[in-house]
Amino acid sequence: SGTTNTVAAYNLTWKSTNFKTILEWEPKPVNQVYTVQISTKSGDWKSKCFYTTDTECDLTDEIVKDVKQTYLARVFSYPAGNVESTGSAGEPLYENSPEFTPYLETNLGQPTIQSFEQVGTKVNVTVEDERTLVRRNNTFLSLRDVFGKDLIYTLYYWKSSSSGKKTAKTNTNEFLIDVDKGENYCFSVQAVIPSRTVNRKSTDSPVECMGQEKGEFRE
């Protein structure tokens, strides 16, 4: 049902990485526009992206208010140029999104190795603590601030001269590993949230190798 030539949105999909969260949907509009509403399970609906011809809406500002809440969005379809018009039941056509809980579902972005420093036979590898758009007391929180000990990093490291990898874990953003003196090593890290059932792991960081500019060596 609905007004002539107006179709309901479909394939509503949450795209979220490190809490940057966009709702996407289809179809590309032909003679129609969309408005999005978002709500927590117990809250009021808030309208966003009014009468847009886009098929995406950035809802980050809403979800970062409480990343542990579960959100629902809906996309309303209106005839272009006649946004007051409603469907046959007296309401505009709309479609609901799947529920979305940012803390449990946002994808972990690709991490970055900030630095590594060798002191004798030890190397300290530091992972960049990426800033998110989640705020507390008017400051942006880092990924570690948000997830705390729920977030771990896995380090993969190997001698530049061989293919055999080793691994280590940390629930901070730093690794201290043993290496053979005089050998160059390469490093890659991955973020993991062990308690999750979906979107548990990030992709691996870019590989960084000793002898390149991010590193520092001290006897």
């Epitope: 280590a168 874990k169 991955q190 993991v192 548990r200 792991k201």
Partner: antibody, heavy 117, light 107 residues
């Protein structure tokens, strides 16, 4: 329901090879790390290695580095262990296990590999 | 590689006894230490992870403590179903290594 089913064990001649399979159901192996662990008769648990099926990273216990290859076919939701140059002391039950990154939460019933002439 | 030394290798106890098993790592493993239980001919299952966290569905009579290199599994009041072999595992760095196991038998 999460299930891991190992297969491919049996009697192998010393110096021979085998390929064990670990078919997973009830979850996507790409979301986890998959390990191989073995237990010789009457002995303790011994770690062989792991794979991150999504990224393809593999890590081995150095004692198996030259003889073991762990792989995964994500389209079949299956992990594999290839072991070469087998010797009598490789006789064991081989288990695959799912690792959350905090602990092994599921593993299979194991498949017995006997190396004997 | 990190060596895990578990003791005792076996112990005899009675139902209702308090049982303590220890595991020592050859260097600091930062609480990346899990305890598993294995019954004869059966699967092994996680009891404790991150040294002190009780796994889902595990009775509260099991507890874990320790940090650095020294860790302990305690069964506050041994039950008939607890007669089994217990293993500690470190998973902070590769290769993952296990203790030799502690077999808990009926006295």
């Amino acid at each position: 329901e999460v299930q891991l089913v190992e297969s491919g064990g049996g009697l192998v001649q010393p110096g021979g090879s085998l390929r064990l399979s670990c078919a997973a159901s009830g979850f996507n192996i790409k979301e986890y790390y998959m390990h191989w662990v073995r237990q010789a008769p009457g002995k303790g648990l011994e770690w062989v290695g792991l794979i991150d099926p999504e990224q393809g990273n593999t890590i081995y216990d150095p004692k198996f580095q030259d003889r073991a290859t762990i792989s995964a076919d994500n389209s079949k939701n299956t992990a594999y262990l290839q072991m070469n140059s087998l010797r009598a002391e490789d006789t064991a039950v081989y288990y695959c296990a799912r690792d959350t990154a905090a602990y092994f939460d599921y593993h299979g019933q194991g498949t017995l590999v006997t190396v004997s002439s | 590689d990190i060596q895990m030394t578990q003791s005792p290798s076996s112990l005899s106890a009675s139902v209702g006894d308090r049982v303590t098993i220890t595991c020592r790592a050859s260097r600091d493993i930062k609480s990346y230490l899990n305890w598993y239980q294995q019954k004869p001919g059966k699967a092994w299952k996680v009891l404790i992870y991150y040294a002190t966290s009780l796994a889902e569905g595990v009775p509260s009579r099991f507890s874990g403590s320790g940090s650095g290199t020294d860790y302990t599994l305690t069964i506050s009041s041994l039950q008939p179903e607890d007669f089994a072999t217990y293993y500690c595992w470190q998973h902070g760095e590769s290769p993952w290594t296990a203790g030799q196991g502690t077999k808990v038998e009926i006295k």
